[in-house]
């Protein structure tokens, strides 16, 4: 019979960063393989990752169709070597995932400082806009395109010679900050969605970039450093 020795998947977990979304589960299969289905609350089930021995399934292509929808997935367990049979009416064991709303729950990926430029006592710091797999009219959208003003960046900056940090915020991808002339500064940024009230409202901090280390250009000194 079709489901002998098969066990339901468990620990179904959504792993999602910048809308790249993978469903993971346990256990590593022994006598079984898995098929995943996903749907919106009002939609039909769509099958993905047919008869896989993996314990994960990339569902990005489905959730990017509407990142503000709420999705539910389920993982079915079939006997290893299973070939779908029209005669089988026995439903295989399955487990439902938690609900997942990409716009509210995808983690913000680590941002990158694209460049900084010093003019006198001002420094312009630019954050790289990350591309996502969300599309509009066959064009991939950036993180800023998707979140708009819901997404802000926090800049942490400090003199290379001290540890006292200052902060600035922007709802664009650029900061313009005042600095002391003749001092080198270090920078790190963090992406934030202030409207979120959960642990995923902030990204991890970007790598630290410091003046005089390849990332920016200074009109003070005439040295030009280009971002690779």
């Amino acid at each position: 019979s079709g489901t002998t020795n098969t066990v339901a998947a468990y620990n179904l977990t959504w792993k999602s960063t910048n809308f790249k979304t993978i469903l993971e589960w346990e256990p590593k299969p022994i006598n079984q393989v898995y098929t995943v289905q996903i749907s919106t609350k009002s939609g039909d089930w769509k099958s993905k990752c047919f008869y896989t021995a993996d314990t994960e399934c990339d569902l990005t292509d489905e959730i990017v169709k509407d990142v503000k929808q709420t999705y539910l997935a389920r993982v079915f367990s079939y006997p290893a070597g299973h070939v779908e049979s029209t005669g089988s009416t026995e439903e295989p064991p399955y487990e439902n995932s938690p609900e997942f709303t990409p716009y509210l729950e995808t983690n913000l990926g680590q941002p990158t400082i694209q460049s900084f430029e010093q003019v006198g006592t001002k420094v312009n710091v630019t954050v790289q806009d990350e591309w996502t797999l969300v599309r509009r009219n066959d064009t991939f959208l950036s993180l800023r395109d998707v979140f708009g003003k819901d997404l802000i960046y926090t800049l942490y900056y400090w003199k290379s010679s001290s540890s006292g940090k200052k902060t600035a915020k922007t709802n664009t991808n650029e900061f313009l900050i005042d600095v002391d002339k003749g001092e080198n500064y270090c920078f790190s940024v963090q992406a934030v969605i202030p409207s979120r009230r959960t642990a995923n409202r902030k990204s991890t901090d970007s790598p630290v970039e410091c003046m005089g280390h390849e990332k920016g250009e200074s009109r003070e000194t005439g040295h030009h450093h280009h971002h690779h």
Epitope: E24, E26, G81
Partner: antibody, heavy 125, light 108 residues
Framework: QVQLQESGPGLVKPSQTLSLTCTVS?????????WSWIRQHPGKGLEWIGE???????RYNPSLKSRVTISVDTSKDQFSLKLSSVTAADTAVYYC??????????????????WGKGTTVTVSS | EIVLTQSPGTLSLSPGERATLSCRAS???????LAWYQQKPGQAPRLLIY???SRATGIPDRFSGSGSGTDFTLTISRLEPEDFAVYYC?????????FGGGTKVEIK
């Protein structure tokens, strides 16, 4: 045949981050296996740290989870271990290994069939 | 966490003798997840047995594995000089994957 080679600093200062890389040669890291890190304290047994699938999904030992990050670079056929806030208790030989799912006669079997030679990491100031 | 307890801790035997090593799990482990490894000083572990009873490629037939559930056994039918080493059982089914504490097989 597939070979694994660990690389990274042999000496790390307390509170710093231990970083090791495992390079896969003679095969592809994207070939459907899991890739693990294991360590062995001096004169002691083996401790599994965590594993990564080529797609980037990870499983970690809960006892180390708060300090461990394992990542993969499929373009270089490498996977890496970062262990933060190290202490002398993290002094060990660190091994990378391939965890293979093997399908036979209607079922899957799992085992670590290829190991690196190991690299000794000492945590000391 | 599944605790694997190996016994004895040390086994003192002569070449040609039979070695029987035990691995007991704190909860049931599918045989598909149970493996045995051999480790010599200064070397990485080497896979001997997977699936509780299947020999890995290139492993001599004097090594055999058996058992199911919570009790597993590695048997070396006739010890050769190169077999004196430490042997570990391991389960790779339930996170965290765990190893037994090892059994040292030494020359008597």
């Amino acid at each position: 045949q597939v070979q694994l080679q660990e690389s990274g600093p042999g000496l790390v200062k307390p509170s710093q981050t231990l970083s090791l890389t495992c390079t896969v040669s003679g095969g592809s890291i994207s070939s459907g296996q899991y890739w693990s890190w294991i360590r062995q304290h001096p004169g002691k047994g083996l401790e599994w740290i965590g594993e990564i699938y080529y797609s980037g999904s990870t499983r970690y030992n809960p006892s180390l989870k708060s300090r461990v990050t394992i990542s993969v670079d499929t373009s270089k056929d490498q996977f890496s271990l970062k262990l933060s806030s190290v202490t002398a208790a993290d002094t060990a030989v660190y091994y990378c290994a391939r965890d293979t799912p093997y399908y036979y006669d209607g079922g899957y079997y799992y085992y670590m069939d290829v190991w690196g030679k190991g690299t000794t990491v000492t945590v000391s100031s | 966490e599944i605790v694997l307890t190996q016994s004895p801790g040390t086994l003192s035997l002569s070449p040609g003798e039979r070695a029987t090593l035990s691995c007991r799990a704190s909860q049931s482990v599918s045989s598909s997840y149970l493996a045995w490894y051999q480790q010599k000083p200064g070397q990485a572990p080497r896979l001997l047995i997977y699936g509780a009873s299947s020999r890995a490629t290139g492993i001599p037939d004097r090594f055999s594995g058996s058992g199911s559930g919570t009790d597993f056994t590695l048997t070396i039918s006739r010890l050769e000089p190169e077999d004196f080493a430490v042997y570990y059982c391991q389960q790779v089914g339930v996170v965290p994957y765990t190893f037994g504490g090892g059994t040292k097989v030494e020359i008597k």
